[in-house]
């Protein structure tokens, strides 16, 4: 039977009355244009909603905005447009919300053509009050907060100036001209690229990378011949033009650009690109585009220095620079990532890794599903997940895969079951074990969200017709109840719940459409009365993550340790609560070959745990460049996976010798780097 329709499904008692008492409608008395919504702070209940619309006049477009504020998770909204002097706010800059619980908000206003600079509205009290500030420049980008100090802001101007404020946008200072890209690093450091000649575009590949650690008092040039740069985890990356041709290579620094090493990655040509897919303090997933317009490349995983890379996955789907990739970090289980590969026959298949890129496999076929028309063998096929690429191709996929760190093991995604992704209308699948096993959860495309750390899953059918029904499940998607939240259906535009999945409130956004009127409306439903009681010890059960063979002593070992979690029983209908903390018990494992990646010059054949030499490097000395010195690598093909905590067991030999030879990577060597002060 279809999910949620068998006899085992126990109904939640009197849920209609309970939800009806906790359903709050708000009709916005202004009119439908565009709407953007931002949460201010964590667990504050404060939501800001900005509605903007353009009025087409004969010569120009006149804009109007309204700003609304809720402090009860969206149940009620107050029009606070007068706090921003009824000014038109530029939606392309969005609402710049400060980090953590700073309560800071910056809105960028539209100003008339002849003005000297832009205008911002600043709040540092969760949008209770705003201060208008006229800027000495016209902003090109949204204000960026320093992650360490929310009083420090940076912005680029339309004239490519880098502007910094040390008092939350009250006073601004231009610290550098001719800036292309600027980013905050750690410890209030700013990294930025500059051009010398014409423009950012003209000087691409001849840019300089600069650093300031004191908000513009002094500077250090930390790189030349730069194409672009990026930050990921504790790594600073720069793609650098080669001396002799138009190729470029990745260089990496772990000391804020003081010293650089050339990453052992293939160089790329003009039409190719590098992309940091994911990064943490241990390692990096790097995509390297294939030559030609193939739409795919190779994923490499780094060592703990970001220098030596192992091939992780071939034919990785990634369309173009800034294009689409399905690469997804499954945040509900350590070490799990999902992505798509482009097969030789141009079909797209989903792959999953449970060990941070060490090995990739297909997703197991859901037990309650049949193989579709793409399958050659009707009994053997796998689940294929729709993500960013499918959405970009306008397939009937309203949402990307969803997982939350505090909803352990849960992954929800649209998918199809066959030999490859299908263009047919997808269904929604759920995994409760981090992607090892899957079940069809809902028939057809849906919007979905996780509430109360997984205690409730909410879904709304994706339809072109107006809707008035929401579905919810209290047992991780096994059984579903439907609730009619309004008599008059609305054209649905989105689900909004507080980031972090700890809330029990969900807001359904849409608009009502009549011949004469089109208005935004939101319905906020609080599920607190559905989960009547707080969860107790008896409501939780012990679950071993990554368990595939309970008989095996090493069962559950991933990246050198196993973790047991306390997880809510599916049958328990209770509140995890806002203060819920995931309870886990780690234990160290013995080292096996699975705890090692293939070293530079080695690769792992499919379905084999042993690393073998790359044929093209057989018999060659393995030498690479490190901090401007040539190193010689003695290895039998393995290196410990970054972040792997295993002890004892297998211990392959690995030794790096300094060859005492200079090697340069056409990058500034440390001694050539210059500093200057303002």
């Amino acid at each position: 039977s279809a999910p949620g329709e068998d006899e085992e499904c126990g109904r939640v008692r009197d849920f209609v009355a309970k939800l009806a008492n906790n359903t709050h409608q708000h009709v916005f008395d202004d009119l439908r244009g565009s709407v953007s919504l931002s949460w201010v702070g964590d667990s504050t209940g404060v939501i800001l909603v900005l509605t903007t619309f353009h009025v087409p006049l004969v010569i120009m477009t006149f804009g109007q905005s309204k700003l609304y504020r809720s402090e009860d998770y969206g149940k009620n909204f107050k029009d606070i447009t007068d706090l921003i002097n009824n000014t038109f706010i530029r939606t392309e800059f969005g609402m710049a919300i400060g980090p953590e619980n700073s309560g800071k908000v910056v809105l960028t206003a539209e100003v008339s053509g002849g003005s000297r600079g832009g205008r911002i509205f600043r709040s540092s009290d969760f949008a209770k009050n705003f201060v208008q500030t006229d800027l000495p420049f016209h902003p090109l980008t949204q204000m960026m907060y320093s992650p360490q100090n929310s009083d420090y802001l940076l912005a680029l101007s339309t004239e490519n100036g880098l502007w910094v404020s040390k008092n939350f946008g009250g006073k601004w200072e231009e610290i550098h001209k001719a800036v292309c890209l600027a980013k905050w690093g750690s410890d209030n450091t700013i990294f930025f690229t500059t051009y010398a000649n014409g423009s950012c575009k003209a000087d691409l590949g001849a840019l300089e990378l600069w650093r300031t650690s004191d908000l513009g008092k002094s500077f250090k040039t930390i790189g030349v011949k730069i194409y672009s740069f990026g930050l990921g985890g504790r790594f600073l990356f720069a793609s650098v033009m080669a001396d002799k041709d138009t190729t470029r290579r990745i260089h990496v620094s772990t000391d804020q650009g003081d010293t650089w090493s050339m990453a052992q990655l293939p160089s790329v040509g003009q039409e190719q690109f590098y992309s940091i897919l994911a990064a943490n303090d241990d390692m990096v997933f790097m995509h390297v585009d294939e030559p030609g317009d193939t739409g795919f490349g190779t994923i490499f995983t780094s060592d703990d220095r970001g220098i030596v890379y192992s091939k992780s996955l071939d034919r990785h789907l990634y369309t173009t620079t800034g294009g689409e990739t399905d690469f997804t970090n499954v945040t509900s289980l350590r070490g799990v990532y999902i992505t798509s590969v482009l097969s030789e026959d141009n079909s797209i298949q989903t792959m999953i890794t449970f060990d941070q890129g060490g090995r990739w496999t297909h997703l197991r076929k859901p037990e309650n599903s049949e193989c579709d028309a793409t399958a050659k063998n009707k009994n053997e096929c796998s689940l294929h997940i729709h993500a960013s690429y499918s959405i970009s191709q306008k397939l009937n996929v309203p949402m990307a895969p969803l997982s939350e760190p505090n909803a352990v093991g849960i992954v929800i995604a649209h998918g199809s079951v066959g030999d490859a992704i299908s263009v047919m209308v997808p269904d929604v699948y759920i995994s409760d074990d981090g992607g090892y096993s899957w079940t069809k959860m809902l028939e057809g495309p849906h919007y979905y969200t996780i509430l109360d750390s997984g205690g409730i899953i909410v879904a709304i059918e994706h339809s072109s017709r107006p809707i008035n029904v929401i579905k919810f499940s209290t047992d991780e998607g096994q059984c579903w109840q439907t609730y009619t939240f309004t008599r008059d259906p609305i054209y649905f535009t989105g689900l909004a719940s507080e980031p972090g999945a700890r809330s029990m409130n969900i807001s359904i956004w849409g608009f009502t459409e009549s011949f004469l009127t089109s208005q935004w409306v939101s319905y906020t439903i609080d599920f607190k009365d559905i989960l009547e009681r707080n969860c107790e010890e008896k409501d939780y059960t012990i679950w071993l993550a990554h368990s595939t063979d309970p008989e095996d002593y090493e069962d559950g070992c991933i990246l050198g340790y196993k973790e047991q979690f306390l997880r809510l029983r599916k049958s328990s209908v209770c509140q995890n609560g806002r203060d819920y903390v995931v309870t886990k018990q780690p234990s160290i494992c013995l080292c096996s070959l699975e705890d090692f990646l293939c070293d530079f010059g080695y690769y792992r054949p499919e379905n084999d745990s042993k690393c073998v030499e790359q044929p093209e490097l057989k018999g060659h000395d393995l030498e690479f460049c490190l901090y401007g010195r040539e190193e010689h690598l003695t290895t039998n093909g393995y290196r410990k996976i970054p972040g792997d905590k295993c002890q004892g067991g297998v211990n392959p030999v690995r030794e790096v010798k300094d060859l005492k030879k200079k090697c340069t990577s056409n990058f500034l060597s440390p001694e050539k780097q210059n500093s200057k002060s303002n």
Partner: antibody, heavy 124, light 106 residues
Framework: QVQLVQSGAEVKKPGSSVKVSCKAS????????ISWVRQAPGQGLEWMGG????????WYAQKFQGRVTITADESTSTAYMELSSLRSEDTAVYYC?????????????????WGQGTTVTVSS | DIQMTQSPSTLSASVGDRVTITCRAS??????LAWYQQKPGKAPKLLIY???SLESGVPSRFSGSGSGTEFTLTISSLQPDDFATYYC????????FGGGTKVEIK
């Protein structure tokens, strides 16, 4: 400048149908609603219904429900009004008009541009 | 449907007179009301929208006021070109017109 040009006069027999067209030029057709209004000889204005071309949905006055069909073809920027089961009391001048809406995109709230009118005579 | 009652149905006035036409809605329509002028054999012409906003190109002697259920169209100084029939129209739900007021020469 937006203009609405309607099809020519029609003489119809009772029980038959009439289809009047309204072609828009010089503006964004899909952004506005199109209303159909009729006026019997010596009588007042009567709203029949309307359509939002960009939305594809039509709305009808209760009196005409089931007898009138309003459609729009975005590719030709033309709206149509078809009235069936004609009776002698349907003899009137039929107007199309651009109808501003209370939404974020539009500023006009009245019928600011009208067609020249199409005379429909129902007679046996 | 919302009913619109216009009064008077006929009004005799002279050039230079101040003329007031009233429109009453059967329920509150906020400010969603428009006024039109129609001359024989011609299509109606929008004068006022949203109860009091003057349509561009319309002389300033025309003004509208009111909200909720009571609305007024005022011609401050009647001109020869103003002799016509005037209609109010609500735009809150589906559209309905008032019965019209004919302004004729006294």
């Amino acid at each position: 400048q937006v203009q609405l040009v309607q099809s020519g006069a029609e003489v119809k027999k009772p029980g038959s149908s009439v289809k009047v067209s309204c072609k828009a030029s010089g503006g964004t057709f899909r952004s506005y609603a199109i209303s159909w209004v009729r006026q019997a000889p010596g009588q007042g204005l009567e709203w029949m219904g309307g359509i939002i071309p960009g939305f594809g949905t039509a709305w009808y006055a209760q009196k005409f429900q089931g007898r009138v069909t309003i459609t729009a073809d975005e590719s030709t920027s033309t709206a149509y009004m078809e009235l069936s089961s004609l009776r002698s009391e349907d003899t009137a001048v039929y107007y199309c008009a651009r109808q501003g809406r209370k939404t974020g995109y539009y500023y006009y709230y009245g019928m600011d541009v009208w067609g020249q009118g199409t005379t429909v005579t129902v007679s046996s | 449907d919302i009913q619109m009652t216009q009064s008077p149905s006929t009004l005799s006035a002279s050039v230079g007179d101040r003329v007031t036409i009233t429109c009453r809605a059967s329920q509150s329509i906020s400010s969603w009301l428009a006024w039109y002028q129609q001359k024989p054999g011609k299509a109606p012409k929008l004068l006022i929208y949203k109860a009091s906003s003057l349509e561009s190109g319309v002389p300033s002697r025309f003004s509208g006021s009111g909200s909720g259920t009571e609305f007024t169209l005022t011609i401050s100084s009647l001109q020869p070109d103003d002799f016509a029939t005037y209609y109010c129209q609500q735009a809150d739900g589906h559209i309905t017109f008032g019965g019209g007021t004919k302004v004729e020469i006294k």
